[in-house]
């Protein structure tokens, strides 16, 4: 009975050639889509001249098919029972699932101006930057197409920088023809309770972005977890998109295409300030923007983004402190639309449905030496876009799952 099923499950979730888990792990059988909503700035001049609140209007979804490429360089290591791989990146625009085309225009923060003025705070260098910004006719805001904003464009200001820097800028540049990793994960052969748990990422057990425990690479990549998941568990996973490990807790039982799954969600506590959640002290990396680590709901990942002042949050600043969203008008956070969840089949530990939601923001600060930032009276964490990456097990796969896994148990 149960022992036989357990034995079968343990055998089938091992990450090695011939198992059900391995086949779906190498190349996901689920169609994964990434939807983008861009925050179109409605009052660029007023912000630049008067330091007004930024009025944004979200436009989307613009949908791309992602994660359709098989893992590469899959290599088993029999000695330490691990398997290493690269996860290739690819995105294909899906016009039928989008409100417009990749050529649609948006008024957004000038990424290069905001980043350069933050990175180079030396007064003399800022004077150089100011002359280059003026010469290139750049401003605090810019109009860019969706394709440019996401995948890259040649920036006119950066093209004038007096030494060879990358002049191409884009929120996800470079993306196509790149890969995430190398990941090295436990294959579960010697210990099934470690299956899919990351041993190293890019050859290291920590990230070098954070202090203390915040820097650890914990858990899996969230595509699956070790089998026999309990509702009481805290599921740890690492997300390279947000340059950190995070966790999910059980919320409710869900029936997904006839398969009983556990819905795990990212709790608001994971985004809390160290005042409320002392464990988060090491995610507070500076004192000014974070108001002495009392602000919450935004994560400064600049160390992971070559010094560029990128802040990650939940969409519409869900679970963020009022001071973060106060200078931005037009945001409407709600849990149903904007939180992240994972629907996990508890016996196998497979994630059969998920919605990963996050928002990309950029910090822009006043600068007395840079004309286009001179009139700002405050710092802004400016929302650029939010994304919803979703995947759901297909009907055929669900039937197979019901007959081979849950059906046998029930």
């Amino acid at each position: 009975g149960d022992l036989l099923i357990q034995k079968t499950i343990k055998k089938q979730v091992v990450l090695e050639e011939g198992t059900i888990a391995f086949k779906n792990w190498v190349k996901t059988g689920t169609e994964v889509y990434r939807q983008f909503w861009i925050f179109d700035v409605q009052n660029p001049q007023e912000v630049m001249m008067n330091s007004s609140n930024i009025q944004v209007k979200q436009r989307g979804p613009y949908t791309y098919r992602v994660r359709f490429l098989a893992k590469e360089n899959v290599t088993q290591d029999a000695e330490d029972n691990t398997v290493s791989f690269l996860q290739p990146n690819g995105a294909i625009f899906e016009p039928s699932l989008s409100v417009g085309t990749e050529a649609d225009n948006f008024t957004v923060l000038n990424l290069a101006v905001a980043a350069a003025s933050h990175i180079y705070q030396n007064q003399f260098v800022q004077m150089i930057l100011n002359s280059l910004i003026n010469k290139s006719k750049s401003s605090m805001f810019q109009v860019r197409t969706l394709r440019e904003l996401l995948w890259g464009y040649r920036d006119p200001f950066l093209s004038l920088v007096p030494y060879p820097v990358t002049t191409t800028v884009g929120l996800f540049y470079p993306y196509n023809n790149t890969a995430d990793g190398v990941y090295k994960v436990f294959n579960g052969k010697d210990n099934i309770s470690k299956v899919a748990i990351i041993d190293t990422y890019k050859g290291k057990r920590n990230l070098s972005y954070w202090e203390s425990h915040c820097d650890m690479i914990n858990g899996t990549d969230a595509a699956s977890f070790p089998p026999f998941v309990e509702k009481s568990q805290v599921l740890q996973f690492f997300s390279s998109d947000i340059c950190r490990s995070i966790y999910a807790v059980f919320e409710s039982d869900v029936n997904l295409k006839g398969i009983p799954v556990y819905r795990f969600v990212l709790p608001s506590k994971a985004f809390a300030s160290p005042v409320e959640n002392p464990d988060n002290y090491c995610f507070c990396t500076e004192k000014i923007i974070s108001k002495n680590c009392t602000s919450y709901g935004v994560l400064d990942i600049s160390k992971c983004k070559e010094g560029r002042p990128v802040y990650i949050s939940l969409p519409h600043f869900l679970y963020a402190s009022p001071d973060v969203s106060e200078p931005i008008d037009g945001l409407n956070p709600n849990e149903e639309e904007h939180r992240t969840y994972l629907d996990i089949e508890p016996i196998t530990g497979f994630t059969l449905q998920f919605a990963k939601r996050l928002q990309v923001n950029l910090l822009v600060k006043p600068s007395e030496k840079i004309q286009v930032l001179k009139n700002l009276k405050r710092n802004y964490i400016v929302p650029i876009l939010w994304l919803n990456e979703t995947g759901t097990i297909g009907d055929e796969k669900a039937n197979m799952f019901r007959s081979q896994v849950t059906g046998k148990i029930n």
Partner: antibody, heavy 115, light 108 residues
Framework: EEKLEESGGGLVQPGGSMKLSCVAS????????MNWVRQSPEKGLEWVAE??????????HYAESVKGRFTISRDDSKSSVYLQMNNLRAEDTGIYYC??????WGQGTTLTVSS | ENVLTQSPAIMSASPGEKVTMTCRAS???????LHWYQQKSGASPKLWIY???NLASGVPARFSGSGSGTSYSLTISSVEAEDAATYYC?????????FGSGTKLEIK
Amino acid sequence: EEKLEESGGGLVQPGGSMKLSCVASGFTFSNYWMNWVRQSPEKGLEWVAEIRLKSNNYATHYAESVKGRFTISRDDSKSSVYLQMNNLRAEDTGIYYCTPLLLRWGQGTTLTVSS
Amino acid sequence: ENVLTQSPAIMSASPGEKVTMTCRASSSLSSTYLHWYQQKSGASPKLWIYSTSNLASGVPARFSGSGSGTSYSLTISSVEAEDAATYYCQQYSGYPLTFGSGTKLEIK
């Protein structure tokens, strides 16, 4: 105000080794590519080596004349850049400056290679 | 290696005179990556003009720079005594980074 202070120069015999250090202040050191440039009456200003940022995996470039003998490194936590020089030759003699090039230069430290 | 040749090696001018010094590159480079430094006797070099024509902070407006491709120049419209120094051109277009041999400006 930005400041760069080189140290470690002195007299060394041909074939010997020396390590130069440079401490920076007044700017966010970790955001700048750092260079060593030397100057001698015979050769004028001569670029020696460059080290980029952590985000560039601390990529380095060297002048052909020092490749394999000199190593540039940096410690962002100490706002410092170093130049380890091995198998020194008489033609390595000169004033060594550390600089992010577009900012100011240090006052330099003098290296003399002579027997 | 992109060799930068400066001429003249030494020049002499009276206060109020206009002077021009040149820097020739052995191969074409982007004007964005051609810079000039001023070095006074006993001092370290200072960035003077960046990206061919942009004056660094604190540089008097009598200085100007121009050029493209392989030919670049630094001009002082009306020389003053404090301009006595050696001026070096430098390229950041490719490795190795190279400096010119310098033009020494003497004031009569």
